[in-house]
């Protein structure tokens, strides 16, 4: 249930944040599931554990497989899992679809790269960026901390980008990539006031209570790229990732633009293994750029199992 | 904005059982432990015990053991705390409490007056 | 059990004096993750606690700066650098570092 996939390199470093979270939690331990085996604390061991943090340094192939952490504390204990895959290097620059990480958006205006998982490491500045495999060189390239900024941007800028940095343990050095697609928004248009297409505002959404429910929250923004544009959910007025519920994950949907022209954003709400509490919670799907911010609310309600039009996954 | 409302006020015979209730709201409830804390009038704070309710399990302190009994509703978000063979030191407010990531106590209930005579 | 003791158990002062309080703990409050379990909160007549610093030294959301606490692993000190009219409640040390949590007897901070 609380489990989360991670993938590296071999021979590059890899570090995984125990996906469980205790409230509160004072020591993490680790465990190779298959044997319920403690992975060791100590810097010497080429795999340890640090905390939240399961280091790799460096990985193996031989390294893929599932991991336990058990976030402990003096009242409770709670368990989570590390599915880990480590992959063997491409002899070619192909970047295989499995190794990459979520595709950005970027226009004239806005052409940062941000370097996927770079926060898990100890790592200095400058990073490394290339494109399809290419050192990024000219002035137009810039790397700042931990992303690429990219001064006009054309649509030939679009491409897959790696990262690549050094992390740094006890004076050891260890090499991490990171991939992800960078995609060009066309800058001609206008922008207008938010205007949400779904959910309707104060939608009453029903729910099975046990399986899983998907919420759209879409919104179009005007016509062409925008500056700023945004689709979010909040839960209770909190940010999903503040929430702080595995469960309940947003994911970026498809940018649209309709063939009126109009360009519009998604973000899917999923709910896996829906509770009862969630039923008590105010969803807002929030759209917002420049113009200001439109809120549309839903809220769950219990399905009755015998009725199979659904939106469940 | 989180918040945590108890149940109002109780007298009680001596021998009685009380159960004092805490709708809890603004966050999600199963992820963050629930305690109750007593406080006898012009004393000091005294934990009683905990929850987990995602899983139910319990801790409680010794001085309370096998008198308490604590309880959670993950439908409604509401964790429960029972006290039986009720005694006249056993007058004190009541307060439930919620948990964060870094620490315990983060968020408290107006509390709860229970008074026990006869 | 680890006791929580803390003195004075109460004092009296002004608005704009420097107020001190001291707790102690019978058994070490430093965890081998190197966190001290120490915690404060500030009490009013009928209101529930409100957390002040956890974990020794670290505000809570939204206290003041003038509340500070210091120590080592069983001696603590609560510090108000220039009381306020809100300042004036009880005061608890506690322990989280295992169970039962305990709390000290508190520390009526009253106005001279």
């Known amino acids: 249930k609380f489990s989360k996939q991670s993938w590296g390199l071999e021979n590059e470093a890899l570090i995984v944040r125990c996906p469980r979270q205790g409230k509160p939690s004072y020591t993490v331990d680790w465990y190779y599931s298959q044997t319920n085996k403690s992975i060791p604390t100590q810097e010497r061991n080429r795999v340890f554990a640090s905390g939240q943090l399961l280091k790799f340094l460096p990985a193996a192939v031989a390294d893929s497989g599932i991991y336990t952490c058990i976030v402990r504390s003096p009242t409770f204990n709670r368990t989570g899992y590390a599915n880990v895959t480590i992959y063997k290097k491409q002899s070619d620059c192909n970047v295989p679809d499995y190794l990459m990480y979520s595709t950005v958006s970027g226009s004239e205006k806005n052409s940062k790269i941000y370097c996927p998982t770079i926060d898990l490491y100890n790592w200095t500045a400058p990073l490394e960026w290339f494109k399809n495999c290419q050192a990024l060189q000219g002035s137009r390239y810039r790397a700042h901390k931990s992303f690429l900024v990219i001064d006009n941007v054309m649509t030939e800028d679009a491409g897959d980008y790696t990262c690549k940095f050094i992390h740094n343990e006890n004076g050891a050095n260890y090499s991490v990539t990171a991939t992800r697609s960078f995609t060009v928004k066309d800058e001609q248009g206008f922008s207008l006031f938010p205007v949400i297409g779904a959910p309707a505002q104060n939608e009453i959404k029903e729910v099975e209570i046990g399986k899983n429910a998907n919420l759209t929250c879409s919104a179009c923004f005007g016509k062409g790229t925008q500056f700023l544009a945004a689709v979010l959910w909040q839960l209770n007025g909190t940010k999903i990732t503040d929430f702080g519920e595995p469960r309940i994950q947003q994911e970026e949907g498809q940018n649209q633009s309709f063939s009126n022209g109009l360009a519009c954003l998604d973000m899917v709400l999923r709910i896996a293994d829906v509770k009862e509490e969630d039923l008590l919670l105010q969803y807002d799907c929030l759209a917002l750029n420049l113009h200001g911010l439109r809120r549309h609310t839903v809220r769950l309600s219990r399905k009755n199992p015998i009725d199979h039009h659904s939106i469940y996954c | 904005e989180v918040q945590l409302v108890q149940s109002g006020a109780e007298v009680k015979k001596p021998g009685a059982t009380v159960k004092i209730s805490c709708k809890a709201s603004?966050?999600?409830?199963?992820?963050?432990?629930m305690h109750w804390v007593q406080q006898a009038p012009g004393k000091g704070l005294e934990w009683m015990g905990a929850?987990?309710?995602?899983?139910?399990?319990?801790v409680y302190a010794e001085k309370f053991q096998g008198r308490v009994t604590i309880t959670a509703d993950k439908s409604s978000s509401t964790a429960y705390m029972e006290l039986s063979s009720l005694r006249s030191e056993d007058t004190a407010v009541y307060y439930c409490?919620?948990?964060?990531?870094?620490?315990?106590?983060?968020?408290w209930g107006q509390g709860t007056l229970v008074t026990v005579s006869s | 059990d680890i006791q929580m003791t803390q003195s004075p158990s109460s004092l009296s002062a002004s608005v704009g004096d420097r107020v001190t309080i001291t707790c102690r703990s019978s058994?070490?409050?430093?965890?081998?993750?190197?966190?001290?379990?120490l915690y404060w909160y500030q009490q009013k007549p009928g209101k529930a606690p409100k957390l002040l610093i956890y974990?020794?030294?670290n505000l809570a959301s939204g206290v003041p700066s003038r509340f500070s606490s210091s120590g080592s692993g069983t001696d603590f000190t609560l510090t108000i650098s220039s009381l306020q009219p809100e300042d004036f409640a009880t005061y608890y040390c506690?322990?989280?570092?295992?169970?039962?949590?305990?709390f000290g007897q508190g520390t009526k901070v009253e106005i001279k």
């Open positions: 409490t919620g948990s964060t990531t870094d620490y315990y106590f983060a968020y």
């Open positions: 929850i987990d309710p995602e899983t139910g399990d319990t």
């Open positions: 603004g966050y999600i409830f199963i992820d963050s432990e």
């Open positions: 058994k070490s409050l430093l965890h081998s993750n190197g966190i001290i379990y």
């Open positions: 974990q020794l030294s």
């Open positions: 506690a322990q989280n570092l295992e169970l039962p949590f305990t």
